[in-house]
């Protein structure tokens, strides 16, 4: 249960994680388990321990074998093995089962690819993306932080993918590549960043003062069940439970879907007895997903009262 | 934009709780749309929970009945109370920020440098 596997490559960085996690505060040691020598902490060495991380800078294909790491704490001790292989560079494009990461899919409206493990190391952007070996080219791919992303995902965009970037310690700098594969599925469910309905953006209302006004926030999601999506009225940038005033309430509509399968929802903004000084105030319908938030603004004006006189 | 620092996180037992905090500062807080991320080692970060106004909170389904989101607006700080834990909810856990801006990408919410959560025995 306390062991992990970690692989790299010759002559490129590779840091490991000791399965085994504590507070901060907690002393790590790691031991060769073959020989039970202690692993130096100094940096000067190219293979070292810091703390929860053992590194490798670079790493050789005779450091391959099981490392064993010990968290201590006043308390108690726990141990941790992590068993480590590294490989020679191919010399060929392929890339073999066992240096892969696990595989992602993507559909056509989320095809996020993650790098794996850079969470590790100390990196900075841009990644640089291959696929198959071939640097990705083109508006479609976006390096975005520590994910690729593929617009308008076609099946043709499965296939291994490869992310490369540099770790730095100490002014020294050393590449790490990393792949796992791509696979589309065609999904039936799907999300996409919020499209407001209604109100238009920036769209004038008019109501009559001491009458009732309600203004309706409707957006769309995508289709099928959304993981996260709302819709909610603010008045001055503020949320309609802080602003403080009961005469305006906020009430959820009925959920919609449509017969295209979109997932829509409702909000219905009720002001009662409106006044003059409602007409002051910006009304902001936000749409929100995990893909972002949209917000349409809307103003209220008076409604001329029609002159009856000939 | 709005600076998070996130605190609470720390090894607990299968079954133990924690509370973690999000203080908020630099932007207006009670117009910002609060909430909690998580990140489990070699795994794409994954929506916890979020706190839309004081009535209005969503989760996902894994943490559903076990987690709660709260804000507190005197202090610009979200929480996330988390019971019943279980080894499979060990991961960094972010808190994020959104609000402003007339449309807004995941990417550009503000995010917290996050906490580590570890379930384990």
């Known amino acids: 249960k306390f062991s992990k596997q970690s692989w790299g490559l010759e002559n490129e960085a590779l840091i490991v994680r000791c399965p085994r996690q504590g507070k901060p505060s907690y002393t790590v040691d790691w031991y060769y388990s073959q020989t039970n020598k202690s692993i130096p902490t100094q940096e000067r060495n190219r293979v070292f321990a810091s703390g929860q991380l053992l590194k490798f800078l670079p790493a050789a294909v005779a450091d391959s074998g099981i490392y064993t790491c010990i968290v201590r704490s006043p308390t108690f001790n726990r141990t941790g093995y992590a068993n480590v292989t590294i490989y020679k560079k191919q010399s060929d494009c392929n890339v073999p089962d066992y240096l892969m990461y696990s595989t992602v899919s993507g559909s056509e409206k989320n095809s996020k690819i993650y790098c794996p493990t850079i969470d590790l190391y100390n990196w900075t952007a841009p990644l640089e993306w291959f696929k198959n070996c071939q640097a990705l080219q083109g508006s479609r791919y976006r390096a975005h932080k520590s994910f690729l992303v593929i617009d308008n995902v076609m099946t043709e965009d499965a296939g291994d993918y490869t992310c490369k970037f540099i770790h730095n310690e100490n002014g020294a700098n050393y590449s790490v590549t990393a792949t796992r594969s791509f696979t589309v599925k065609d999904e039936q469910g799907f999300s996409l960043f919020p499209v407001i309905g209604a109100p238009a953006q920036n769209e004038i209302k008019e109501v009559e003062i001491g009458k009732n006004a309600n203004l309706t926030c409707s957006a769309c999601f995508g289709k099928g069940t959304q993981f996260l999506a709302a819709v909610l009225w603010q008045l001055n940038g503020t949320k309609i439970t802080d602003f403080g005033e009961p005469r305006i309430q906020q009430e959820e509509g009925q959920n919609q879907s449509f017969s295209n399968g979109l997932a829509c929802l409702d909000m219905v903004l009720r002001i009662a007895d409106v006044k003059e000084e409602d007409l002051l105030l910006q009304y902001d319908c936000l749409a929100l997903n995990l893909h972002g938030l949209r917000r349409h603004t809307v103003r209220l004006s008076r409604k001329n009262p029609i002159d009856h006189h000939s | 934009e709005v600076q998070l620092v996130e605190s609470g996180g720390g090894l607990v037992q299968p079954g133990g709780s924690l509370r973690l905090s999000c203080a908020a500062s630099?932007?207006?807080?009670?117009?910002?749309?609060m909430g909690w991320f998580r990140q489990a080692p070699g795994k794409e970060r994954e929506f916890v929970a979020v706190?839309?106004?004081?009535?209005?909170?969503k989760y996902a389904d894994s943490v559903k009945g076990r987690f709660t989101i709260s804000a507190d607006n005197s202090k610009n700080t979200a929480y996330l109370q988390m019971n019943s834990l279980k080894p499979e909810d060990t991961a960094v856990y972010y808190c994020?920020?959104?609000?402003?801006?007339?449309?807004?990408?995941?990417?550009?919410?503000?995010w917290g440098q996050g906490t580590l959560v570890t379930v384990s025995s």
């Open positions: 994020a920020a959104v609000g402003g801006a007339t449309t807004v990408t995941a990417s550009e919410w503000d």
């Open positions: 630099g932007s207006t807080f009670s117009n910002a749309v």
């Open positions: 706190i839309i106004d004081s009535r209005t909170t």
